[in-house]
């Protein structure tokens, strides 16, 4: 059916399939050192890994994409690992009137799926 | 800033960057011929193409990902081309009580971005 259950066990071996991974990044890495004061370093959760057939399918479209990729790999790309949700992050940054806190809702991934 | 404007012109040449493409698929291709009656064939819009630095960035996370991929390509993958929105689709399918229409909201892509 259009709502086949997405597969949750990785057939490629541990750590190979789409998952959340932490990447350390400094303000310099991000190019933010001129306007962000704090934190000096961010633990950035990102989505990495492969998306084998029906693994963590985001939705019906992803299931179709996986199937058609199997039939026409040159024409249809495999689904890829992207955030399914985000963790809000607070940054302390410079403004014209001083410093202020601002929340960013789409900065750090909280979960991943194959889309 | 965290909200740098995503780039909209493709530096790789026409048709190479993330865009919407139509793929024809039959019910047999999709494995749906046992439960869907109509349509016999679907024009499936899918997201294909590459995501060069800051091209059609979905959000701040995608911009960070693009930047860190430039710094640590082995550790951080490039953003990839996925649907930003969907076109609802109706399918006519068999049920125990007869045939009926059902709308699927996440079946055909309407727009794409790099996430």
């Amino acid at each position: 059916s259009a709502h086949a259950h997405p597969r949750d066990s990785c057939p490629l071996g541990p750590g190979r399939c789409c998952h959340l991974e932490t990447v350390q990044a400094t303000l310099e890495d991000l190019g933010w050192s001129d306007w962000v004061l704090s934190p000096r370093q961010l633990q950035l959760s990102m989505c990495v890994g492969e998306c084998p057939h029906l693994y963590r399918s985001a939705n019906t479209h992803a299931q179709i994409k996986a199937r058609l990729h199997g039939l026409q790999p040159d024409k249809v790309p495999a689904p890829c690992c992207v955030p399914s949700s985000y963790t809000p992050v607070v940054l302390m940054h410079r403004t014209d009137s001083g410093v202020s806190l601002q929340t960013y809702d789409d900065l750090v991934a909280r979960g991943c799926h194959c889309a | 800033s965290a909200h740098a404007h995503p780039r909209d012109s493709c530096p790789l040449g026409p048709g190479r960057c993330c865009h919407l493409e139509t793929v024809q698929a039959t019910l047999e291709d999709l494995g749906w011929s046992d439960w869907v009656l109509s349509p016999r064939q679907l024009q499936l819009s899918m997201c294909v193409g590459e995501c060069p630095h800051l091209y059609r960035s979905a959000n701040t996370h995608a911009q960070i990902k693009a930047r860190l991929h430039g710094l640590q390509p082995d550790k951080v993958p490039a953003p990839c081309c996925v649907p930003s929105s969907y076109t609802p689709v109706v399918l006519m399918h068999r049920t125990d009580s007869g045939v009926s229409l059902q709308t699927y909201d996440d079946l055909v892509a309407r727009g794409c971005h790099c996430a």
């Epitope: - | 009656l37 109509s38 016999r40 076109t87 609802p88 689709v89 109706v90 045939v99 229409l101 709308t103």
Partner: antibody
Framework: QVTLKESGPGILQPSQTLSLTCSFS??????????VGWIRQPSGKGLEWLAH???????YYNTALKSRLTISKDTSNNQVFLKIASVDTADTATYYC??????????WGQGTTLTVSS | DIVMTQAAFSNPVTLGTSASISCRSS???????????LYWYLQKPGQSPQLLIY???NLVSGVPDRFSSSGSGTDFTLRISRVEAEDVGVYYC?????????FGAGTKLELK
């Protein structure tokens, strides 16, 4: 719940243009596979397919009447329109609009009656 | 255009007994994909038509299973296994193999 409702002038004189409106709810004409068609039925007689319009703006007109018909849609306001130029007494009928999904015509309006009389 | 032919009236039927309504098309409605593009509608007195049967043999959800349909490429039959008072009306067959979709003239189901 899907509902469709036709509206029209009721009475016209020969050679005038008939303008019909189908107002619908419960579905969207921006959904892939959905269309709206117009069908008419002279009193006590059978059904005749006039025209239909799809979600992607593709249109079909009955060949026998094509030169007189114009179908259009206003997706955001859930309306479909049909114009029939230079009506004649033979156009006296009940006009129905109906929802299409591919080849499935599942929901019809209650119909609006047109009388063409001089 | 494909012509759909129906008798104007059915044989009068008694409530609780079965009824059959026939329809013939001027061209086979069986497509190369295996689907027969034949439909049955019922128009009850003072109402708009309602779809009963989809693609020759598929009952539409919500329609009582007293209704069934069968046929070849050109000859079709709608059967009502136990006729009820609410089944009275005009039954139309229609084709959607080719544009324009065309309807039969309708068969009026009459009770004894």
């Amino acid at each position: 719940q899907v509902t469709l409702k036709e509206s029209g002038p009721g009475i016209l004189q020969p050679s005038q243009t008939l303008s019909l409106t189908c107002s619908f709810s419960g579905f969207s004409l921006s959904t892939y596979g959905i269309g709206v068609g117009w069908i008419r039925q002279p009193s006590g007689k059978g059904l005749e397919w006039l025209a239909h319009i799809w979600w992607n703006d593709n249109k079909y007109y009955n060949t026998a009447l094509k030169s007189r018909l114009t179908i259009s849609k206003d997706t955001s306001n859930n309306q479909v329109f049909l114009k029939i130029a230079s009506v004649d007494t033979a156009d006296t009928a009940t006009y129905y609009c109906a929802r299409l999904a591919y080849d499935y015509v599942d929901s019809w309006g209650q119909g609006t009656t047109l009388t063409v009389s001089s | 255009d494909i012509v759909m032919t129906q008798a104007a009236f059915s044989n009068p039927v008694t409530l609780g007994t079965s009824a059959s309504i026939s329809c013939r098309s001027s061209k086979s409605l069986l497509h190369s994909n295996g689907i027969t593009y034949l439909y049955w509608y019922l128009q009850k007195p003072g109402q708009s038509p309602q779809l009963l049967i989809y693609q020759m043999s598929n009952l539409v959800s919500g329609v009582p299973d007293r209704f069934s349909s069968s046929g070849s490429g050109t000859d079709f039959t709608l059967r009502i296994s136990r006729v009820e008072a609410e089944d009275v009306g005009v039954y139309y067959c229609a084709q959607n193999l080719e544009l324009p979709p065309t309807f039969g003239a309708g068969t009026k189901l009459e009770l004894k």
